[in-house]
């Protein structure tokens, strides 16, 4: 894992932390799939998207993500060196208009319609955890990531570095 | 001020062993990624190892993979490497540096260290 | 693994000149990719990251881009202090690369 030693440790600061421009550094349009090749796909259902973790048939086309990445600088650290971190977050947008969100009393993930500025609620920090995989922790509440849960993505509490690792918060990055 | 201070390099025989330091300071330590890079004399920069700032799964360069060992002490603020079976080809100036983000390796490393050199010869 | 080529490897320029170096990586990085300059018996400084942000405190007359394979940095009016070697490196997946270095020197 990337983290520290106790997730909160650094994760405390995100509440106060600002997105240092409102324009991303970069832009990447991606599939997103589980640790365990899961395809992340989006449905339009009732005029409302659904999000879905499943098995796509073989040469079956996978659902794009604009991943948009800022930086976020938070406030000076507790040991008082006054070094500020600097943090990379994400939106995720499958389609014009539409965020990824946290819902957090529900510990779901859902896709809103929104106008910018996006809301809090729309921004993830980045991990990047083994080689090739990547985590995303609710801006709005710290040590709480988007995962897999019942083949859907859920909103998933993780106490301690070393659980920064389990496979149902590990997501890759595909541009195929 | 961010500081990164490499020392413990020296002369060694080949089939030697070594162990590198970096003492840092200015920043929260257990906050960042850690990465060593060399440069044999009159070459350019070689990326060696990485560790993460809670000092899991560590990577390394294929040239090094089972001689070195990256590690980290959070509570001494200190970067280590050892290494081992030492080869001429390993001769270089090492340089310790920190990543640019906290939780994210993407951004390339911001600080360095003014580096320490090896220098592996019978 | 992923290679990196940078090109020219040595260039010859004057005060006041724009240079341009190119990097290719052998397969995408999307944008993660940085860009150091450094100095004869001096440590690498970071001067762009993610391909086209300027690093904290340096001029403004250094700029990157490009994404994917194909990426450049340009110094639009080269300064004395300038002169130096500039190296490329992919931070997108391990083992991390660098290029093999461009050398700007005084024509």
């Known amino acids: 894992a990337f983290g520290i030693s106790g997730v909160q440790k650094y994760t405390r600061a995100l509440h106060d932390s600002s997105i240092t421009g409102i324009s991303p550094i970069t832009e990447y349009l991606a599939s997103l799939s589980t640790y365990n090749d899961q395809s992340i796909t989006f449905a339009l259902e009732d005029e409302s998207y659904e999000i879905y973790v499943e098995d796509l048939k073989k040469d079956e086309k996978k659902d794009k993500v604009l991943l948009s990445y800022y930086e976020s600088q938070h406030p000076s650290n507790e040991s008082g060196d006054g070094v500020d971190g600097k943090m990379l977050m994400v939106t995720l947008s499958p389609t014009k208009d539409f965020w990824l969100h946290a819902n957090n009393k529900e510990h779901s993930v859902e896709l809103h319609k929104c106008e910018k500025p996006l809301p809090d609620q729309a921004f993830f920090v980045l991990h990047n955890m083994h080689s090739n995989c990547v985590s995303f922790e609710c801006k709005t509440d710290p040590g709480v990531f988007i995962g897999v849960k019942d083949n859907h993505l859920a909103l998933i509490k993780v106490d301690s570095s070393e659980n920064l690792c389990t496979e149902n918060i590990l997501f890759k990055l595909s541009e195929t | 001020e961010v500081q990164l201070v490499e020392s413990g390099g020296g002369l060694v025989q080949p089939g030697g062993s070594l162990r590198l330091s970096c003492a840092a300071s200015?920043?929260?330590?257990?906050?960042?990624?850690l990465t060593w890079v060399r440069q044999a004399p009159g070459k350019g920069l070689e990326w060696v190892s990485f560790i993460s700032g809670s000092g899991g799964r560590p990577f390394y360069a294929d040239s090094v993979k089972g001689r070195f060992t990256i590690s980290r002490d959070n509570s001494k603020n200190m970067l280590y490497l050892q290494m081992n079976s030492l080869r001429a080809e390993d001769t270089a100036i090492y340089y310790c540096?920190?990543?640019?983000?906290?939780?994210?390796?993407?951004?390339?490393?911001?600080?360095w260290g003014q580096g320490t050199l090896v220098t592996v010869s019978s | 693994d992923i290679q990196m080529t940078q090109s020219p490897s040595s260039v010859s320029a004057s005060v006041g000149d724009r240079v341009t170096i190119t990097c290719r990586a052998s397969?995408?990085?999307v944008s993660w990719l940085a860009w150091y300059q450094q100095k004869p018996g001096k440590a690498p400084k970071l001067?762009?990251?993610?391909?086209?942000s300027l690093q904290s405190g340096v001029p403004s007359r250094f700029s990157g881009s490009g994404s994917g394979t194909d990426f450049t940095l340009t110094i639009s009016s080269l300064q004395p202090e300038d002169f130096a070697t500039y190296y490329c490196?992919?931070?997108?997946?391990?083992?991390?690369?660098l290029g093999p270095g461009t050398k700007v020197d005084i024509k």
């Open positions: 490196q992919q931070s997108n997946s391990f083992p991390f690369t």
């Open positions: 397969q995408g990085v």
């Open positions: 001067l762009i990251y993610a391909a086209s």
């Open positions: 200015g920043f929260t330590f257990s906050s960042y990624a």
């Open positions: 540096a920190k990543s640019l983000y906290t939780t994210s390796w993407y951004g390339g490393f911001d600080s």
